[in-house]
Structures are given as structure tokens and as C-alpha cells.
Amino acid sequence: ITQQDLAPQQRAAPQQKRSSPSEGLCPPGHHISEDGRDCISCKYGQDYSTHWNDLLFCLRCTRCDSGEVELSPCTTTRNTVCQCEEGTFREEDSPEMCRKCRTGCPRGMVKVGDCTPWSDIECVHKESGTKHSGEVPAVEETVTSSPGTPASPCS
């Protein structure tokens, strides 16, 4: 996922909706003006804010990387939701990029979990049933994984 730099937006165009802050905060879909007197709406498809805030600018929408699919577009109150393409996954410990799922399990192991957008295939030892968490072995059995069905997005 490419998160663009957060940068102040240009001065609010006349067509942007304005309202008054509540307890010094502006509602989702808005940011506060420099003088703190107005709430200025975010620009649809360009930037957003998800909670009550005193942001001086809305946050720029994420653009999905190549290798990702857009599950839902950016709105004024929600950032873009991106997900790894079929056959690839993004681990929570390495959120920077989608990695290819393994095509099969090492010898002596069986597949118990499919490739999903957020996890590689899961392999366990045939005898003990313990999980395998090592590097992809040089020799793999011809146990193929089916693409995981998209469910919840990677974020």
C-alpha cells in the first residue's frame, strides 16, 4: 500500500462545505480551519478523516500498489481498502508488500490451511501435527494450494 505524504491541502475552495466545530473538533469527513472557526469538508476521492478531529488538513487517500486489488474506494470518511491479489499475501509483521504464497508443503508435511490475502499456506508435520514456520524448502511436494477467498481486508 502506498501512503502518500500528509500535506496541508490548498485553501478551501468556495464549493467546500463548512460547518462549526463542536467542542473544538470537526466530524468525520472534515478538518478544522486554521483559525479554528470552521469545519471544512474533505474532498471525495482525494482525502478523508475517519473520526472527530482537530486536523488542519484531511489525510490523503491511499493508492493501492500493483499486486493489490481495491476492495473499496476512498470516501471522505474512509480510506481506500487494498488487498493482496489471489495467490499472494501480506503478513502483519511485514505489511509493506504482498508476497507470493508457497505452492506446496515440504516433504513430510501436509497442507491444513489455504493461501489467503493475509496468510501463506499452512503446513503441519504428518506425524506430530506441529506447524512449519521455516523458509520455503528447495524441494516441495506437488501439494498445490487453492487461492483463498477474500474476506477481511489487510490493513
Epitope: L6, T50, D54, L55, L56
Partner: nanobody
Framework: EVQLLESGGGKVQPGGSLRLSCAAS????????MSWFRQAPGKGLEFVSA????????YYADSVKGRFTISRDNSKNTLYLQMNSLRAEDTAVYYC??????????????????WGQGTLVTVSS
């Protein structure tokens, strides 16, 4: 590796105030979004507030709007949460969170983030 240490929790009467601190070590926090979450007894994690990495402003959950104020001191590598007009429903363990990579405010408990051990806040008469 980032270590986060929360402090400032304790027992307070309804209507009272507390100031939580989160001291970070292992990385400068100045370029990172940071957040507070809380977990009430028997409940799930709830987003409380977040600070944008470049001090462009802050996010607040509906439940704390107007009562809590998040701030940070980048020179001290510390995040704060000033909690006023405390209510019984604010009783929870409060956690400080920092993202592994520079990004927008963390408002979801999912994802690769660093978490502190938490500090308990009890609001009771």
C-alpha cells in the same frame, strides 16, 4: 525494536482527571502516528485517540470527544493522554500504540503495530 511504557493510571472518582504517559524507546516517535486504545473488563479493544505523525492534529472516538486530549512531546519521545470528566465507563486498561511504518493514524487494533503493556484506569466512587 520499539519499547513502549505506559504510566499514570490509577483509581479516581467520577468527574476526576488523570494524565497518562507513554514513553517510547528504540525509535524516535516524531515521524510516526501514535494512538491510545483501551480494553474494559470483558470487552474488546476500543480506539480512544490518535496523534498524526507530523502534529497536523488528532483523532478522537465519539465516546471521549471533548473530555480527553492527546498530545506528544517529540523531544521526550513521549505520548500523553489527558483525561478529564472521567466516568465509570472509562474504566479500562489503556494501551499506547505506534505503527511499525510511518502511516496515517492507527484506529484499528489489527495490523503490525507496537503495543505497550498497558496501564489500568479505574473510575469508581
Amino acid at each position: 525494536e520499539v519499547q513502549l511504557l505506559e504510566s499514570g493510571g490509577g483509581k479516581v472518582q467520577p468527574g476526576g482527571s488523570l494524565r497518562l504517559s507513554c514513553a517510547a524507546s528504540g525509535r524516535s516517535i516524531s515521524n510516526y502516528a501514535m494512538s491510545w486504545f483501551r480494553q474494559a473488563p470483558g470487552k474488546g479493544l476500543e480506539f480512544v485517540s490518535a496523534s498524526v505523525w507530523n502534529n497536523g492534529g488528532n483523532y478522537y472516538a465519539d465516546s471521549v470527544k471533548g473530555r480527553f486530549t492527546i498530545s506528544r512531546d517529540n523531544s521526550k519521545n513521549t505520548l500523553y493522554l489527558q483525561m478529564n470528566s472521567l466516568r465509570a465507563e472509562d474504566t479500562a486498561v489503556y494501551y499506547c500504540v505506534v505503527a511499525r511504518t510511518p502511516e496515517t493514524p492507527i484506529t484499528s487494533a489489527r495490523g503490525a503495530n507496537y503495543w505497550g503493556q498497558g496501564t489500568l484506569v479505574t473510575v469508581s466512587s
